[in-house]
Amino acid sequence: MRTEAQVPALQPPEPGLEGAMGHRTLVLPWVLLTLCVTAGTPEVWVQVRMEATELSSFTIRCGFLGSGSISLVTVSWGGPNGAGGTTLAVLHPERGIRQWAPARQARWETQSSISLILEGSGASSPCANTTFCCKFASFPEGSWEACGSLPPSSDPGLSAPPTPAPILRADLAGILGVSGVLLFGCVYLLHLLRRHKHRPAPRLQPSRTSPQAPRARAWAPSQASQAALHVPYATINTSCRPATLDTAHPHGGPSWWASLPTHAAHRPQGPAAWASTPIPARGSFVSVENGLYAQAGERPPHTGPGLTLFPDPRGPRAMEGPLGVR
């Protein structure tokens, strides 16, 4: 079952409560507005370095510049995760590491940065112009991803400077994150406030049909507003990616083109406090992906007003493997 963010339908205030309600309506937008303005925007940086000793060996370093706690890091190559990118490693701050050839060694450098060394030989070694992406899932900011690659003229042993260039992803809560939700709330409440000022309070009509007020679904943007913001991904070089087969034989080089193993996007897990709380049975995690809370098992339908979702052409399980197929 999916639990959606819901707002009660607007009901006229009771006559006796009008003063208190009016006062509350005045205070709330300003509180929210303050929060909106002060909410910081996190960033992800990516640094790609070619080792001087092994010319086809790469070191990728990624970091998260934000105040939230990181719940998962996914490193991929060939483009953003879930957009044709192939997972190289998944790092969880408490649960450990899963990685895939040609990754040689993934590790945490600090609480908010990781490094990944890639093997330099064999059919699965990266091309010099490969794009590497790092996706940080954090609470409460959501998911943020940035990509980087070696500059064309890189000398061995030199590294590309860190690139804090996050790619906008509609399945990432970080697009608006908390501040986006608050901003929407601010605008909405200011709109209510204006209407409330210009209209006398009508009499309360008791509902004859239902004891509970009808509920309006939050975050259901129109097609027009969905189309309002569409940021394309960075160009992805796929020249060194073989095709997949039903029979996955790694003879003649490991089958590294695996995309994420299955079960992470389509069953998102709650990034909150994994370290300290006992983990509930599978399927009961709470997701903060997309900025809305939803019971794990189904994705929330929309990210927010005015945002275009980037559905994965491979279907709901395309993001799978962050943890190596389930």
Partner: antibody
Framework: EVQLQQSGPELLKPGSSVNISCKAS????????IDWVKQSRGKSLEWIGA????????FYNQKFKGQATLTVYKSSSTAYMELRSLTSEDSAVYYC????????????WGTGTAVTVSS | DIVMTQSQKFMSTSVGERVSITCKAS??????VDWYQQKPGQSPKALIY???NRHTGIPDRFTGSGSGTDFTLIISNVQSEDLADYFC?????????FGGGTKLEIT
């Protein structure tokens, strides 16, 4: 019921190769990684490597790299491990195990395949 | 490689007793430790994952605790069917490594 049914015992000569199979049933094969574990007699367990049945992505313990090769056939929901250049040190029980990436552990173990290498 | 040390190779206990099996990691592995039980002639099976979470169907007599480098599996009210080898596993970093095992004997 979720099961990982492995192929039967093998008696082999030094220098030969063996292909151990692991047939999955009771779940969607491509939804879970398959890892392989070695248990030598009187010894503990050793992790060999992992394969993602969705796409064939692999990762090996350096100790077994070059000797073990992991493959999958999605159509028959079967994982395979080939061991080459066998020596008496390779005599052991080999297990395929299912990795649950929601909770990060080996939730289902195969029936085990005993491999004996003897001249 | 991370070394997982189970210092007690053998432990002897009686039915109804409480027993603690320990596992020490050579470096900080956070909560990335699981416990597996292997009865004679059988494949191992999952008991505890991520240090303290019981696998489906495991009785609450089995409790896991610890984080960092020291981990404990406690079996309270030991039953005769608990006669088995118990292994810890770390998946904090590659290669994943198992402890040497503790054989629990019931007297």
């Amino acid at each position: 019921e979720v099961q990982l049914q492995q192929s039967g015992p093998e008696l082999l000569k030094p220098g030969s190769s063996v292909n151990i199979s692991c047939k999955a049933s009771g779940y969607t094969f491509t939804d879970y990684n398959i890892d392989w574990v070695k248990q030598s007699r009187g010894k503990s367990l050793e992790w060999i490597g992992a394969i993602n049945p969705n796409n064939g992505g692999t990762f090996y313990n350096q100790k077994f790299k070059g000797q073990a090769t992991l493959t999958v056939y999605k159509s028959s929901s079967t994982a395979y491990m080939e061991l080459r250049s066998l020596t008496s040190e390779d005599s052991a029980v080999y297990y395929c195990v299912r990795w649950d990436s929601d909770s990060w552990y080996f939730d289902v173990w195969g029936t085990g395949t005993a491999v004996t290498v003897s001249s | 490689d991370i070394v997982m040390t189970q210092s007690q190779k053998f432990m002897s206990t009686s039915v109804g007793e409480r027993v603690s099996i320990t596992c020490k990691a050579s470096e900080n592995v956070r909560a990335a430790v699981d416990w597996y039980q292997q009865k004679p002639g059988q494949s191992p099976k999952a008991l505890i994952y991520l240090a303290s979470n019981r696998h489906t169907g495991i009785p609450d007599r089995f409790t896991g605790s610890g984080s960092g480098t020291d981990f404990t599996l406690i079996i309270s009210n030991v039953q005769s069917e608990d006669l088995a080898d118990y292994f810890c596993l770390q998946h904090w970093n590659y290669p994943y490594t198992f402890g040497g095992g503790t054989k629990l004997e019931i007297t």
